[in-house]
């Protein structure tokens, strides 16, 4: 058993049918010695008396808010949560496996640049009685500071019969140098509590591996005289690290017909312009990627050929 | 990814082309190592990230773009002195910092070159003959060093009398390639920045 926060405790259980569970001793936080009784949640049934209460925690029915009283007055509370260990592996019931970029990916994180700011998000089908708390650091043995905000519900989607909820959090490394070569990964830890179930999820990454630039901005077309060709131009996104000559991007320019089946013409360039043939009803899209370290491509910025 | 390779203009900063080749070569070598050593811990998540140049050179700090010198987190000032007569500086008015930067890059390359050559000698003794260093990568390191053209004492190749542990050598190769790829990215950024200024 360990303390998650004041008066909230997590009982770790080897979770299998007929398991013996864990013996837990609760102590009433009071100078009183006599006439103390204990109850669980809203029930008025007295579970025991005395300054301490010994319970065998086996299942969720044994978890909840234990309260010690004296003469009708509440003295203190202890909330017991359960953390299930199933065959040596901590349960992951609360969050959905996003399966990207690999199986067992519960937290996904992205950064728009090298400033040390990043966003993580996760999915669940649970709509109520759910709380999250996020902590982060650079490295784990001698951790350096990363400050995270509160997790917020950022999207709701309908997936088949189920509703899916996306939560996200923004974090900022306290003293980040955009040019630094990372040798210790960022660690992100999310505590999830659903009713009386506790779970924790972690992700470990280097900022350089989660970079996904914003799409190029100011995408414009300039027709070339007496030609079907157009000059496409764009700019670096505002959120990208500066100076751009140091944090350079490379670009992919795509000409796509109306039909998805039509052949796509693609050109790669390090410049912020390109000359392409504009077909009728086609659209031109441009996306960006770090020129020197191949992390994710940005989303496409698009303009119609007409 | 297969991107068209830009050939440098004659007036272009002489080292940019070499640094682009270097990054391409080390990335290819790392990919090859990951595939060949699939049963070894060779991914970024599995290896310890060690920097053999730590406390010996200060490339990131010495080559910091002017715009980032206002960022206190980037000014991890380390006193390091280097020789300053590189040919990449030809026909350009350069500051002491720029010379310091390029000589720091040269020292990095020299250190990695020694490590890679020592390691290759061990790998050549492996009866499994599973993996060797790409000669192209070693040649590209050499070309960039020549382009930088700094006078520096030659570091003797490390020789080891004990029987090599091939498993450890291969893991060390992965660690070294990951670190060198990160340094090659920094070098490329620096060359691109200097070329633009």
């Amino acid at each position: 058993i360990w303390e998650l926060k004041k008066d909230v405790y997590v009982v770790e259980l080897d979770w299998y049918p007929d398991a013996p569970g864990e013996m837990v001793v609760l102590t009433c936080d009071t100078p009183e010695e006599d006439g103390i009784t204990w109850t669980l949640d809203q029930s008025s049934e007295v579970l025991g008396s005395g300054k301490t209460l010994t319970i065998q925690v086996k299942e969720f029915g044994d978890a909840g808010q234990y309260t010690c009283h004296k003469g009708g007055e509440v003295l203190s509370h202890s909330l017991l949560l359960l953390h299930k260990k199933e065959d040596g592996i901590w349960s992951t019931d609360i969050l959905k496996d996003q399966k990207e970029p690999k199986n067992k990916t519960f937290l996904r994180c992205e950064a728009k640049n090298y400033s040390g700011r990043f966003t993580c998000w996760w999915l669940t089908t649970i709509s109520t009685d759910l709380t999250f708390s996020v902590k982060s650091s650079r490295g784990s043995s001698d951790p350096q500071g990363v400050t995270c905000g509160a997790a917020t519900l950022s999207a709701e989607r309908v997936r088949g019969d189920n509703k899916e909820y996306e939560y996200s959090v923004e974090c900022q490394e306290d003293s980040a140098c955009p040019a630094a070569e990372e040798s210790l990964p960022i660690e992100v830890m999310v505590d999830a509590v659903h009713k009386l179930k506790y779970e924790n999820y972690t992700s470990s990454f280097f900022i350089r591996d989660i970079i996904k630039p914003d799409p190029p901005k100011n995408l414009q077309l300039k027709p070339l005289k007496n030609s079907r060709q157009v000059e496409v131009s764009w700019e670096y996104p505002d959120t990208w690290s500066t100076p751009h000559s140091y944090f350079s991007l490379t670009f992919c320019v795509q000409v796509q017909g109306k039909s998805k089946r039509e052949k796509k013409d693609r050109v790669f360039t390090d410049k912020t312009s390109a000359t392409v043939i504009c077909r009728k009803n086609a659209s031109i899209s441009v996306r960006a990627q770090d020129r020197y370290y191949s992390s994710s491509w940005s989303e496409w910025a698009s303009v119609p050929c007409s | 990814r297969n991107l068209p390779v830009a050939t440098p203009d004659p007036g272009m900063f002489p080292c940019l082309h070499h640094s682009q080749n270097l990054l391409r070569a080390v990335s290819n070598m790392l990919q090859k190592a990951r595939q060949t050593l699939e049963f070894y811990p060779c991914t970024s998540e599995e290896i310890d990230h060690e920097d053999i140049t730590k406390d010996k050179t200060s490339t990131v700090e010495a080559c910091l773009p002017l715009e980032l010198t206002k960022n206190e987190s980037c000014l991890n000032s380390r006193e390091t002195s280097f020789i300053t007569n590189g040919s990449c500086l030809a026909s350009r008015k350069t500051s002491f910092m720029m010379a310091l930067c390029l000589s720091s890059i040269y020292e990095d390359l020299k250190m990695y070159q020694v490590e890679f050559k020592t390691m290759n000698a061990k790998l050549l003794m492996d009866p499994k003959r599973q993996i060797f260093l790409d000669q192209n990568m070693l040649a590209v390191i050499d070309e960039l060093m020549q382009a930088l053209n700094f006078n520096s004492e030659t570091v003797p190749q490390k020789s080891s009398l004990e029987e090599p542990d091939f498993y450890k050598t291969k893991i060390k190769l992965c660690i070294l390639l990951h670190a060198f790829r990160i340094r090659a990215v920094t070098i490329d950024r620096v060359m691109s920045y200097l070329n633009a200024s």
Partner: antibody, heavy 115, light 112 residues
Framework: QVQLVQSGGGVVQPGRSLRLSCAAS????????MHWVRQAPGKGLEWVAF????????YYADSVKGRFTISRDNSKNTLYLQMKSLRAEDTAVYYC????????WGQGTMVTVSS | SYVLTQPPSVSGTPGQRVTISCSGG????????VKWYQQLPGTAPKLLIY???ARPSGVPDRFSGSKSGTSASLAITGVQAEDEADYYC????????????FGTGTKVTVLG
Amino acid sequence: QVQLVQSGGGVVQPGRSLRLSCAASGFTFSSYGMHWVRQAPGKGLEWVAFIRYDGSNKYYADSVKGRFTISRDNSKNTLYLQMKSLRAEDTAVYYCKTHGSHDNWGQGTMVTVSS
Amino acid sequence: SYVLTQPPSVSGTPGQRVTISCSGGRSNIGSNTVKWYQQLPGTAPKLLIYGNDARPSGVPDRFSGSKSGTSASLAITGVQAEDEADYYCQSYDRGTHPALLFGTGTKVTVLG
């Protein structure tokens, strides 16, 4: 004590269907994940499928994906395996088992796919 | 389809020490715990070892398990006639959990 009693096995022609059941008692069935494991005659153990305690997630071996469906009825304390498009290579003893560090197995039920 | 490799058979005379190996990889045994089962002919498997080296109550202490790196082993010290059975190791793969990964199985023969 914990008990898993299996039923539903038998002889079936290739291409036909069969449903296996596993009735649980002696524990809170709705709190635990469940597996199906099979063993072809004279061969080793092969995992078939898993279902979460609440039925929200199901996992299958590649060899049965798209043909077999694992399900549970927590109100009846019963686990099921619906097997469709059966093949000769599905011939085996099928076991249900609880998920956890200490597990309990059903007695097994024989499924023979033969023409 | 078996990722955990066991020797097909091992044998020993009563009282001898018999060991069975189970060889896997970094993503399975290297990252997860190992179980061992005993299966007597015509019966369901019986759990002998869980969590690499822990014995459930009722399992004789002549059975012991261990794990090192990407391999695990089961030892029977002072093998007895009633130990003649098939033995299976089991683990998980970190990418496909909760799918069970079973070993190829080992037939233990007690001679004499």
